[in-house]
Interface confidence: medium
């Protein structure tokens, strides 16, 4: 009788766009056919997927966050067939460009400023806030009560993922007015917003220069 197969992996926490992952269907069995399923469907052809060693080894050449699985392998011969337990990959990714909410860019003097930052990332990123280039706090939410014109400036949310070793940032320029009237309604609608200001994060320019130059 065929043994129940199992999957071994060379990397259970791969980094998106960086790592390849090799999944091996164990054990080696003579006169058997190896089969693979991803998300409960038979393996479909993809330039990023490579089968080798008589289909016993499945290689994901460059993982993305969509490649978590689950993965199952099976072995079969003319007598019987057996299927492994599912294996899920913990693909680490991000942090993506953060979004600062709410979208307001203009505030009245005396109002409370309550900014929240979110970035898609696995694992969850570390959040930091900088105001006019100065680090203020390491939290996802920035709260300042009773703001004045002294609080004008560039509010940056900086996110860092220790697992991927990657950082990202976004900045919005906020104006505080002493006028009585609230800013007019915009023709744009959203649940959050932010903006980019590259000059604050010198270290990031190294990353940008792979795609851009000054």
């Amino acid at each position: 009788e065929l043994p129940k197969p199992y999957i071994s992996s060379n990397n259970s926490n791969p980094i998106e766009d960086k790592d390849a992952v090799t999944l091996t269907c164990e054990p080696v069995a003579e006169n058997t056919t190896y089969l693979w399923w991803v998300n409960n469907q038979s393996l479909s052809v993809s330039p990023r997927l490579q089968l080798s060693n008589g289909n016993r080894i499945l290689t994901l050449l460059s993982v993305t966050r969509n490649d978590t699985g689950p993965y199952e392998c099976g072995i079969q011969n003319s007598e019987s067939a057996k299927r492994s337990d599912p294996v899920t990959l913990n693909v680490t990714y991000g942090p993506d460009t953060p979004i600062i909410s709410p979208p307001d860019l203009s505030y009245r003097s005396g109002a409370n400023l309550n900014l929240s930052c979110h970035s898609d990332s696995n694992p969850s990123p570390q959040y930091s806030w900088l105001i006019n280039g100065t680090l203020r706090q390491h939290t996802q939410v920035l709260f300042i009560s009773k703001i004045t014109s002294n609080n004008n400036g560039a509010y940056a949310c900086f996110v860092s993922n220790l697992a991927t070793g990657r950082n990202n940032s976004i900045v919005k320029n906020i104006s505080v007015s002493s006028g009585d009237s609230a800013p007019g309604s915009s023709g744009l609608s959203a649940s959050g917003s932010g903006s980019g200001l590259n000059d604050i994060f010198e270290a990031q320019k190294i990353e940008w220069h792979h795609h851009h130059h000054h």
Partner: antibody, heavy 120, light 108 residues
């Protein structure tokens, strides 16, 4: 090479519907927010909608809110714009565009566009 | 919303000249401005981001400058292939964008 290819445009009567698609290749689609931008016959560019990389966050121009729906299928590397209750002022060339990644949301890649004409 | 105003709809210049296209924001947008070039029948091509950074492959005759509310795209030593329309865009309110109305560059 990054490529964005739009399709689904055409001639439609006021009040009608269309679904635009944008097939992406050459980059990890699921890592990027994506946007739709339109260009009117007068050549004015107007941002229409943006969807975050995972699809959790969605943003619209006020004049299309409730009529247009942006969505994505990361498994198929495809961005969509479902347009309903179309008006003559929606006539435009519709582009899908990719905001850049690191702290710079300027749109670094654009598709070739698909034309939408709303006319009776 | 933030209005981006390109006051000159058309500009005429000669090959070899230097020309400046301007864009004014209705409120402070820091340096969160991009410039795009659009040739007839083509989609917009990114030239400049963060007000002054060129995308790779963009000739160094294209220079962006400005911050706050006033921005300029300067093309030095204008070439015939620079015949195009140029648009500014703010993304201080990302992911909500607004564009300028465009400036069409004509070569004499």
């Amino acid at each position: 090479e990054v490529m964005l290819v739009e399709s689904g445009g055409g001639l439609v009567k006021p009040g009608g519907s269309l679904k635009l698609s944008c097939a992406a290749s050459g980059f990890t689609f699921s890592s990027y927010a994506m946007s739709w931008v339109r260009q009117t016959p007068e050549k004015r560019l107007e941002w229409v909608a943006t969807i975050s990389s995972g699809g959790s966050y969605i943003y619209y121009l006020d004049s299309v809110k409730g009529r247009f729906t942006i969505s994505r299928d990361n498994a198929k590397n495809t961005l969509y714009l479902q347009m309903s209750s179309l008006r003559s002022e929606d006539t435009a060339m519709y582009y899908c565009a990719r905001p850049a990644y690191y702290g710079n949301p300027a749109m670094d890649y654009w598709g070739q566009g698909t034309s939408v004409t709303v006319s009776s | 919303d933030i209005l981006m105003t390109q006051s000159q709809k058309f500009m005429s210049t000669s090959v070899g000249d230097r020309v400046s296209v301007t864009c004014k924001a209705s409120q402070n947008v820091g340096t969160n401005v991009a410039w795009y070039q659009q040739k007839p029948g083509q989609s917009p091509k990114p030239l400049i981001y963060s007000a002054s950074y060129r995308y790779s492959g963009v000739p160094d005759r294209f220079t962006g400058s400005g911050s706050g509310t006033d921005f300029t795209l300067t093309i030095s030593n204008v070439q015939s292939e620079d015949l195009a329309e140029y648009f500014c865009q703010q993304y201080n309110s990302y992911p909500l964008y607004t564009f300028g109305g465009g400036t069409k560059l004509e070569i004499k």
